[in-house]
Structures are given as C-alpha cells and as structure tokens.
C-alpha cells in the first residue's frame, strides 16, 4: 500500500476517533446502575457522566442535572475530565499538523520536511489516544472495584457505561490511525519513490522509426 | 485492639452547629469504611452516615442529608461528623463504627448530643 | 426504605433455657448475586455500645460463644440463645445491611 493510502486510511480513522472521543466525553454514561438483585424495587437508572447524572424512570422519562461545583466532584471525574477534553484538544492540534504533512496539500514544499510533520502528526494521534486511555481505564478499574467491593451499598453499585466503550473505540481508532500515519511518513523518508511523484525526464528525439523511447513511461 | 473515641459531644441550641470527632487506632484506618450511627434516649439505633475508605463516597440517612457532613482524615486515623441546624430531635448518644461488609464491627463508647434551648 | 420487625419486644427469660427471638424484614435480604442474606445481630448491654454477634444471617463473630446461633431466610430470622446465661440480659438488635438506608429493629430486651 502506497504511503498516501496509508496517510489517507489514517486520518479517516483519526478523525472517527476523534468523532468518538467526543461523543464519549459528552455522553453522561460513563457508569449505570447496576441491578445485582430482583428483590432491589427501583423505578428508576442511574446515569452518571463527567458533566451531568441522569435519572431514567421506568416509564422512558428522563430527567438530567449538570454537576454545580467543580470543587465538589471526585478527583477521577474532575481528572477525566481534563484528560479528555485534553486529548480531543490535541486531535484537533495533530488534524493541522497530519494536513499539513500531508502529500496531497501544499503547506510544505515535499521532502524529507513534509514527511516529518506528517509523522509528527501520527505520533500526535498516538499520544492523543494514549492520553484518552488513561480516564476511560482509571474510571473503569473504580467502576469494577466498587462492584465488586463488599463494603459498598447494593443500591450505589454500577457498571461500566456505553461511553466508556465508546471512549475506548475511540481511543483504538485514533491509535491504529495515528499508527498508519506514522508508517505512512516513514515510508516517505525511506522510500521517497513510493511518495511523491516520478519526476519526468523530456523525451529524447525521435529515433529513426519515430517512436519515442518508452522507458520513461510508467 | 480496635479502639474508637469519640469526642466533641455537648448541650447546644437549636439551628446550631457541632463538630464530633472519632480518633481510631488498632487497625489500618484506611482499609475501612465507617459510619455514625445514634442511639436516642431509651429508643433504638438508627444508621446515620457512612463514608468511604478515601472519602470519595458518603451516604446519609434521610433524616439528616443536607444538614449533616461525614468526612475523614486517614493521616490523622480520625472520622468527623459535622452537625448544622441541629433539631432537638438529633438529641442521641453518638457512636463511631467501622463498617466492613455494611455491617458494624467495632463501635466507640458514644458521645451524647443534646438540642436543647 | 426496608423496615425490621423484631418480636417480642421483650421476654422473660430464666437461666439455662433455650431463648429464641424474631426478626422479619420487609423485603428479601437475600442477595442471589453471591448467595447470601444480609443481616446481622447486636448485643446491647445497659450502658454499653452495642457488640456485633452475628453478620451474613449465620457467621458468629470471633469470641462470641457458640450458644449464640443465627438463621432465617430471606425475610424471616431468628436469633437463638442455648443455654441461656445471666451475662446474656441485654437488648438484642437486628440490622439489614443489605443496602443503605441500613436498618435496625426495634429491639428485644431479655428480662429476667
């Protein structure tokens, strides 16, 4: 595969990352309640995210609040949530650099330069995805060791929220896509013929039978 | 030996405040959840906070949210219950439990509180 | 809120006799997660803390003598006293530690 198939593939998939890292950032179920038992009688789920909780009735209604104090907040939310906004920031950062590392714009003249940005945009990503990795696996590992604790009230136990397996998608898509980018630019530094395109020499003169020499077509 | 002391107890006024405190000692104070729970005069024993081995999770009983605040310093191996609008009902002996297994293993001697005007 | 029920409120109790004593809940204290009944006995004797005897419905705690035995279902329970002793007379309390809020019976108070 062609380094600008490997750029292009790449960025796709960063920028579904990057789709899916805000999504999960935004989405208030970073943890639900969890029903261990029948003989619990609740109407209602609990939804709890990094900027708001929700409470599901049975009947479909639901009603959200926004968390009033930063100060009041737990450390791993108020941790999560600098680390994702954080990680999404970046992204934004690494989609200039990728695009203007990348082959098919002219941001940079083409050379050994273009393909470090571009690799510098791939490794962007990768600490993007390693940076979203740390909150989704710090909150999950509370989430399970609460559950599993049995010190803490059944009604106060939960599970692990689509947004954490959102967020964890997201987390892979912008590692893989920031990993193609990187072998993409490597592959520009290393086989500069494989990059950017065959520079043609003129056609000699006519030969004797008027055909032109073929060897510099591709 | 597991040992729970209570102190900070005492008469005040409705709508005031009071500060109780629980220093422990004989165990690993931050392996343990632990609660408050009183006892009013010659009724029964009613639940009234828990909070978490690092304090990152409380839990009250109705009768006192809002008003009432658990908190901890594992550095200092004590447990405070913080006491706002009190009402002549909070009138109790204060025990200061561990609370392994939402059960309640060691319980101090009991501080009395009394609300009256 | 689970509510306990703990009957009788008192008894007459003489020493050396089988004393048996009742604690119901208003719902299962039952946990069919990990198979096992949230609920606990203590021991109050006049002017002391209360003493936990036994938790998880059966499990005595260490020291407290094997005349003491817990049962029960999910929502019926019984503490049972062997060999009634005069250290025994106390206020025995039941305590659903299922879910919060944690809940206590009333109490039963053993008289001689």
């Known amino acids: 595969m062609g380094s600008a198939a490997l750029e292009i593939l790449g960025l796709v998939l960063c920028l579904v990352g990057w789709g899916g890292l805000i999504l999960a950032c935004g989405l208030p179920m970073w943890q639900v309640t969890a029903f261990l038992d029948h003989n619990i009688v609740t109407a209602q789920t609990t939804w709890k995210g990094l900027w708001m909780s929700c409470v599901v009735q049975s009947t479909g209604h639901m009603q959200c609040k926004v968390y009033d104090s930063v100060l009041a907040l737990s450390t791993e939310v108020q941790a999560a949530r600098a680390l994702t906004v954080g990680a999404v920031l970046l992204a934004f950062v690494a989609l200039f650099v990728t695009l203007a590392g990348a082959q098919c714009t002219t941001c940079v003249a083409p050379g050994p330069a273009k393909a470090r940005v571009a690799l510098t945009g791939g490794v962007l990503y990768l600490l993007c995805g390693l940076l979203a990795l740390v909150p989704l696996c710090w909150f999950a590992n509370i989430v399970v060791r609460e559950f599993y604790d049995p010190s803490v009230p059944v009604s106060q136990k939960y599970e692990l929220g689509a947004a954490l397996y959102i967020g964890w998608a997201a987390t892979a898509l912008l590692m893989v896509g920031g990993g193609l980018l990187c072998c993409g630019a490597w592959v520009c530094t290393s086989r500069p013929d494989l990059s950017f395109p065959v520079k043609y020499s003129a056609p000699r003169r006519p030969t004797a039978t008027g055909d032109y020499d073929k060897k510099n077509y591709v | 030996e597991v040992q729970l002391v209570e102190s900070g107890g005492g008469l005040v006024q409705p709508g005031r405040s009071l500060k109780l405190s629980c220093a422990a000692s004989?165990?690993?104070?931050?392996?343990?959840?632990m609660a408050w729970v009183r006892q009013a005069p010659k009724k029964g024993l009613e639940w009234v906070a828990s909070?978490?081995?690092?304090?990152?999770?409380?839990y009250y009983g109705d009768s006192v949210k809002g008003r009432f605040t658990i908190s901890r310093d594992n550095a200092k191996s004590t447990l405070y219950l913080q006491m706002k609008s009190l009402r002549s009902e909070d009138t109790a002996t204060y025990y200061c439990?561990?609370?392994?297994?939402?059960?309640?293993?060691?319980w101090g001697q009991g501080v009395m509180v009394t609300v009256s005007s | 809120d689970i509510v306990m029920t703990q009957s009788p409120s008192s008894l007459a109790v003489s020493a050396g006799e089988t004393v048996t004593m009742n604690c119901r809940s208003s719902?299962?204290?039952?946990?069919?997660?990990?198979?096992?009944?949230?609920l606990a006995w203590y021991q109050q004797k006049p002017g002391q803390s209360p003493k936990l005897l036994i938790s998880?419905?059966?499990t005595r705690e260490s020291g407290v003598p094997d005349r003491f035995i817990g049962s029960g279902s999910g929502t019926d329970f019984t503490l049972t006293i062997n060999n009634m002793q005069a250290e025994d007379l106390a206020i025995y309390y039941c305590?659903?530690?299922?879910?919060?809020?944690?809940?206590f019976g009333a109490g039963t108070k053993l008289e001689l």
């Open positions: 439990t561990r609370h392994p297994r939402r059960y309640f293993d060691y």
């Open positions: 909070i978490s081995y690092e304090g990152r999770n409380t």
């Open positions: 719902q299962s204290l039952f946990s069919s997660g990990d198979q096992k009944k949230f």
């Open positions: 305590q659903q530690h299922y879910d919060i809020p944690y809940t």
């Open positions: 004989g165990f690993t104070f931050s392996d343990y959840y």
């Open positions: 998880l419905a059966s």
